[in-house]
Interface confidence: low
């Protein structure tokens, strides 16, 4: 049967450690005698070494909790493929028994003394409770024992006296209306409330105590609306300086709602706290220059040579661009006005060509006319000569890339009767009408 195989056996605990895996036989697991195995159903961990006695287990708890008892411990024959000694098979337990004593003596019950006298009643009128006590000392308990039952008992008692009724205030009545209508006047508004000594009234016989404290209460009114103060504008402040150095700008004047400040819910100032004015510097703003698009590359030539077309001779060509639109001391364009590169001229060179794959379909033409069509092409593409892609410059300038320039004359085998371009056309389907989107909004 397959077992769990482990790489270690812990002698002190008898546990398997370092799981190797499951689903192997005992025989395979125990090819290494340092290993250990365990049945799948959570059985005993067995070491793969030859059988011998395990360490003794810890002593079991003492059989009694007080006075002399006894306790057991065991060890087990563990291992694989054999036995611990003659007639001692794997799994056999060996026991040891010894005397033990957790506590020298056992607890002994004590006995109660007689009940003491009843204490006075807990109240001086009507009904209450009284208590009496006894001691656990006839005899005293031994070895942590105790006496059975309670050390005190209580019973009801009646003083035969009627209790006086002391006066207590009823709830306060509602506050009277306020004596004024807003805060901050010459007389601070007040409100008043009263209460009666009737919850309950004090008894006559035996005489009860009257209610303590006043029957009336005064306080300043709260929650009254304060007398409102409307806000008023202060004067306009100075005009801010024009914030621009050229063209038109905007200056601001400000005023504050503080003469007076609105108070106690009074209305704020009506109107705007700021007003703006246009300011004119009468100075035109500078316009920075911007590079126009690069011009066409010049013909690819080499100094002192009439023509280098179709030759493996690198030449040079340049292109120019202009800085447009700079006015009123604006920034000049940054960067180079001229661009120079190295080139091979293949202008009008007969080159072997090959047909390209079909291009993607183009747009439908005409987009708004009758019967629009779309087209795709295959082109006779020239195969460029395998000239060196870079040239070495004078020392310190390193390698420079060389670009092919010019329009060659590619030669391809005829395709559908054509030598340079084969075109395929298709009508466009379900064509919508062209309408001005602004008209559609109306």
């Amino acid at each position: 049967d397959p077992v769990l195989c482990f790489t270690q056996y812990e002698e002190s605990s008898g546990k398997c450690k370092g799981l190797l895996g499951g689903g192997v036989s005992v025989k395979d697991c125990c090819l290494n005698t340092a290993y250990a195995y365990q049945e799948r159903n959570g059985g005993l961990c067995q070491p793969c070494r030859s059988p011998r006695w395990s360490l003794w287990s810890t002593w079991a708890p003492c059989s009694v909790t007080c006075s002399e008892g006894s306790q057991l411990r065991y060890r087990r024959c563990v291992g694989w493929n054999g036995q611990c000694s003659e007639r001692v098979a794997l799994g056999t337990l060996e026991w040891q028994l010894q005397a033990c004593e957790d506590k020298q003596c056992c607890p002994e019950m004590g006995g109660w003394s007689d009940w003491g006298p009843w204490e006075p009643c807990s109240v001086t009128c009507s009904k209450g409770m009284r208590t009496r006590r006894r001691a656990c000392d006839h005899p005293a308990p031994k070895c942590g024992g105790h006496c059975p039952g309670e050390a005190q008992e209580s019973e009801a008692c009646d003083t035969q006296q009627v209790c006086p009724t002391h006066g207590a205030w009823a709830a306060w009545g509602p506050w009277s209306p306020c004596s004024g209508s807003c805060h901050g006047g010459p007389h601070e508004p007040k409100e008043t409330r009263s209460r009666t000594c009737s919850a309950p009234e004090p008894s006559q016989k035996p005489p009860g105590k009257p209610c303590p404290g006043p029957a009336y209460e005064h306080r300043k009114c709260t929650g009254l609306p304060p007398c409102p103060v409307a806000g008023g504008w202060g004067p306009w402040g100075p005009v801010s300086p024009c914030p621009v150095t050229c063209g038109l700008g905007q200056t601001i004047e400000r005023r504050t709602c503080n003469r007076p400040v609105p108070q106690h819910g009074g209305p704020s100032c009506a109107g705007d706290a700021t007003r703006t004015h246009i300011c004119n510097t009468a100075v035109p703003c500078p316009v920075d220059g911007e590079w126009d698009l690069w011009g066409q590359w010049s013909t690819c030539v080499r100094r002192n040579m009439k023509s280098i077309s179709c030759e493996e001779i690198p030449g040079q060509q340049s292109r120019w661009r202009t800085c447009k639109g700079r006015k009123f001391d604006g920034h000049r364009c940054t960067g180079q006005q001229q661009d120079i590169r190295h080139c091979y001229s293949i202008q009008h060179c007969p080159l072997k060509g090959s047909w390209s794959e079909w291009s993607t379909w183009g747009l439908c033409m005409p987009p708004c006319g009758p019967n629009p069509t779309r087209a795709r092409q295959r082109l006779c593409t020239p195969l460029l000569p395998k000239y060196p892609p870079t040239v070495s410059m004078v020392e310190g300038q390193g390698e420079k890339n060389v670009t092919f320039w010019g329009r060659p004359l590619p030669r391809c085998e005829e395709l559908q009767g054509q030598k340079l371009v084969v075109e395929e056309k298709r009508p466009c389907l379900h064509v919508p009408a062209c309408k001005d989107p602004e008209e559609e909004k109306l």
Partner: nanobody, 119 residues
């Protein structure tokens, strides 16, 4: 801790099919083997099939060719497809997960699902 919950057991006629599922939750990243173990009334527990983390499978001779073990790691679920069921397949089927820890292995068990094959 790992929790295992089986489902899919029930009464089926001989020759019929059942599919058992075992949903695992908890510290499942350290599980290296999962297995189906069955216990027929009055008999010892018996390993039916097990599958390793990398998908290696083991079957008891009595179920080879009839039962298929599989696991869906995205759903943390173990399955046992049981075809051509026989009366002797009647048992409580337990899902078992074997977890690898640095200091030893731990076995986890589901509560079991009863499969009864009877006409």
């Amino acid at each position: 801790e790992v929790q295992l919950v089986e489902s899919g057991g029930g009464l089926v006629q001989p020759g019929g099919s059942l599919r058992l599922s075992c949903a695992a939750s908890g510290r499942i990243s350290s599980i290296i083997h999962m297995a189906w173990v069955r216990q027929a009334p009055g008999k010892q527990r018996e390993l039916v099939s097990e599958i390793s983390r990398v998908g290696t499978t083991v079957y008891a001779d009595s179920v080879k060719g009839r039962f298929t073990i599989s696991r869906d790691n995205s759903k943390n679920t173990l399955y046992l497809q049981m075809n051509s069921l026989r009366a002797e397949d009647t048992a409580v089927y337990y899902c078992n997960a074997l977890q690898y820890e640095k200091h030893g292995g731990a076995d986890y068990w589901g509560q079991g699902t009863l499969v009864t094959v009877s006409s």
